[in-house]
């Protein structure tokens, strides 16, 4: 009992502290931290004995999106969708769950993260893990051999996510893919161009796109003496090089995965290299690697890719990185991953990556897995890691203390005197019918000050004020909320004036 009383006192004190910090306009981060502490204290307090024991929360790894977060999300999506459309993509959608059989055998070690559904209808179902496998199923099922499409939807993974770093069990993916038989590397180059366009437009900081090729990796493993059966598991070790040192990776390969130390050293000579087209040229001259058919094909394609990337003006954003070994089993050719760069602490140091924000590659065999005759449809695509981007954009806006509008209301219909509700209702209806985004307060006789305050808080730029005199004169007082400047506008000109002031096209086409 004493413990509960102490906790109640702490909750009260912490609540006062939070209110005080808000009044003092303390930093957003400090307020956020103290609010989080308050919530943790309240959680320990639990419900009153009189209240139910059920803890009201979203499931692990999920979250609600507040209006503010949704506003950020919609802005991000808008940038992405405009880019996808600019590149001529169509849009598709697929079910949120698939037959379990569709997803099995496509993700290698990651298959354990697939959510299976308990279904009474007899079908074994799973929530989709990504948008790529459902896309391949869609192509095979509809016998399509040629499509450029984008798909933005939620996917599900039974991960143990670090939600503070923008990782969840339910999260959005934004995918763009080109399916079809085309000349080498042209669609691949366009995917990289799209990735760069989106990341530049979002202004989330400097980035680098690492590029490699599955065939180069496989060829390199073969000449270094890795047995076929160990390719995938060694790949997953190599892929950790962006997070841990070569020593740690080598220890894992030798200690845990049973690779001979000299084989690991040979791999180390390759995977620690990264550069541009000159590294491709250098490896084409490598006496061992150039003798491997797969690696040679991969290097030839990468050389061509760099030519196209130069023409697209993005070669400075691309790094050929032999340690890139993306985890998914279905990649067959070029693979790439975009990472945001931290500014180096000292000049002369290499930039540090702070996590993947986009990735993709070529997967020429995936559609064939669904075709009874194994007919292949070559595909290449990319996926934008929007959850991480949402987190970064939200943090940036918080740091800048930018106010984000969560509605698009252009005008509030207000009254300066009592008994004008009917007139407000008539006017707001006229505005809605004309395509104007308008609101009114749900009170018969709201105070003018309260109406103006509402506009300030919601970021509404204009107020249309009705008064007795204005009604007689056939005018409406149009007030700018920021400048407080008021002008009388003839009622028949009001729609046009609001559209002019808010930069909206004059006709709803």
């Amino acid at each position: 009992m004493a413990e509960r009383a102490a906790l109640e006192e702490l909750v009260k004190l912490q609540g006062e502290r939070v209110r005080g910090l808000k009044q003092q306009k303390a930093s957003a981060e400090l307020i956020e931290e103290e609010v989080a502490k308050l919530l943790k204290l309240k959680a320990q307090l639990g419900p009153d004995e009189s209240k139910q024991k059920f803890v009201l929360k979203t499931p692990k790894g999920t979250r609600d999106y507040s209006p503010r977060q949704m506003a950020v999300r919609e802005k991000v999506f808008d940038v992405i969708i405009r880019c996808f459309k600019r590149h001529g993509a169509e849009v598709i959608d697929t079910p949120v769950f698939e037959l379990k059989e569709t997803l099995m055998g496509k993700y290698g070690e990651d298959s354990k993260l697939i959510y299976d559904l308990k279904d009474q209808g007899g079908e074994l179902l799973s929530l989709r893990y990504d948008l790529t496998v459902p896309f391949a199923r869609y192509l095979a099922m509809n016998k399509l051999t040629n499509i450029k499409r984008y798909h933005i939807a939620k996917v599900y993974r039974r991960d143990n996510p670090a939600m503070t770093r923008g990782r969840y069990r339910e999260f959005y993916q934004c995918d763009f893919d080109i399916a079809g038989n085309f000349d080498p590397m042209i669609p691949d180059a366009e995917c990289l161009k799209i990735m760069c366009e989106i990341l530049s437009s979002l202004q989330i900081g400097d980035f680098l796109v690492k590029v490699n090729d599955r065939r180069i990796l496989d060829g390199m493993f073969a000449i270094c003496g890795v047995s076929d059966s160990k390719f995938r598991t060694i790949c997953s070790s190599v892929d950790k090089l962006d997070k841990v040192s070569w020593e740690e990776v080598k220890n894992e390969m030798v200690g845990e995965k049973g690779l001979a130390p000299e084989v690991a050293d040979r791999i180390g000579d390759y995977v620690q290299q990264h550069g541009g087209v000159s590294l491709v040229e250098q490896l084409l001259q490598d006496p061992k690697l150039s003798q491997n058919k797969q690696a040679l094909e991969g290097l030839g394609d990468l050389k061509l890719l760099f030519e196209y990337l130069t023409l697209f003006g993005i070669d400075d954003k691309i790094s050929f990185d032999l340690s890139l070994a993306r985890g998914l089993d279905y990649y067959t050719g070029v693979i790439y991953e975009a990472v945001l760069l931290q500014t180096p602490a000292q000049a002369g140091e290499e930039p540090l990556g702070v996590g993947s924000v986009a990735a993709g590659g070529r997967y020429d065999g995936l559609v064939g897995m669904f075709d009874p005759k194994g007919r292949k449809v070559p595909c290449v695509g990319l996926s934008i890691g929007v959850e991480r981007i949402f987190s970064i954009v939200e943090q940036r806006l918080e740091a800048l203390e930018e106010k984000i509008r969560t509605t698009e209301t252009q005008v509030l219909v207000a009254s300066a005197q009592k008994k004008l509700l009917e007139e407000r209702l008539k006017l707001v209806s006229e505005l809605w019918d004309a395509g104007i985004k308008a609101e009114l307060l749900y009170k018969k006789n709201p105070k003018l000050l309260n109406q103006l305050q509402y506009c300030e808080e919601a970021g509404i730029p204009l107020v249309a004020i009705i008064g007795e005199q204005e009604l007689k004169d056939g005018v409406i007082k149009l007030r700018s909320v920021t400048s407080r400047e008021e002008v009388d506008v003839r009622r028949e000109d009001l729609v046009e004036e609001i559209k002019r002031r808010t930069g909206q096209p004059l006709c709803i086409c």
Epitope: A6, L7, E9, L10, L13, E16, R17, E29, E33, A36, K37, K40, L41, Q44, A162, T164
Partner: antibody, heavy 120, light 107 residues
């Protein structure tokens, strides 16, 4: 019962580095803010740094900012303090401490302390 | 930074005595104050938190009071095991600071 055990202290020359560790047991480590508090020989207590439950927030006292780094590994129930560019005035017993009721900056459980001596 | 000043810096008393130690904050800290006891060669031990709440397992002869800037720790009837150094600490804002300590000695 709640237990905090520090390790990693010792004698180091000025400008040198040490990494202190604190192994926690007997409670759900990942729910608690944790801190390092030090006490110079014969002197009072000084709150050096803290880290939030999920590592989102960290703070350092002015005299160590930029030289010390606090971190934690919830999977290993461990708290760390990386100390670089050590100075004679960093000589102290370093205690690992747990926050009261998970988030209140009052230490309700302390380790036995580990002595760091900075001397040439 | 918030400065914490304890008085007296040392006090001599006998078993059974009533002892009061005071702690003053350089600015208002509401009730964000704790009291600790430390014996030589040992880690501090929490006695009182948020000015007046007794930590579980601490004898009821210890009590705390105050708010704002002035706080007191009272030991109603000194026991032999109470001879130690006592520290106050503010938990209002970082850096969280301690008083310089009050050494309680046997008379």
């Amino acid at each position: 019962q709640v237990q905090l055990v520090e390790s990693g202290g010792g004698l180091v020359k000025p400008g040198g580095s040490l990494r202190l560790s604190c192994a926690a047991s007997g409670f759900t480590f990942s729910d608690y803010y944790m801190s390092w508090i030090r006490q110079a020989p014969g002197k009072g207590l000084e709150w050096v740094s803290y880290i939030s439950d999920k590592s989102r927030y960290t703070k350092y006292t002015d005299s160590v900012r930029g030289r010390f780094t606090i971190s934690r590994d919830n999977a290993k129930n461990s708290l760390y303090l990386q100390m670089n560019s050590l100075r004679a005035e960093d000589t102290a017993v370093y205690y690992c401490a747990r926050y009261l009721y998970q988030v209140i900056a009052i230490a309700d459980a302390w380790g036995q302390g580990t002595l760091v001596t900075v001397s040439s | 930074d918030i400065q914490m000043t304890q008085s007296p810096s040392s006090v001599s008393a006998s078993v059974g005595d009533r002892v009061t130690i005071t702690c003053r904050a350089s600015q208002g800290i509401s009730s964000w104050l704790a009291w600790f006891q430390q014996k030589p060669g040992k880690a501090p031990k929490l006695l009182i938190f948020v000015a007046s709440n007794l930590e579980s397992g601490v004898p009821s002869r210890f009590s705390g009071s105050g708010s704002g800037t002035d706080f007191t720790l009272t030991i109603s009837s000194l026991q032999p095991e109470d001879f130690a150094t006592y520290y106050c600490q503010q938990a209002e804002s970082f850096p969280y600071t301690f008083g310089q300590g009050t050494k309680l000695e046997i008379k």
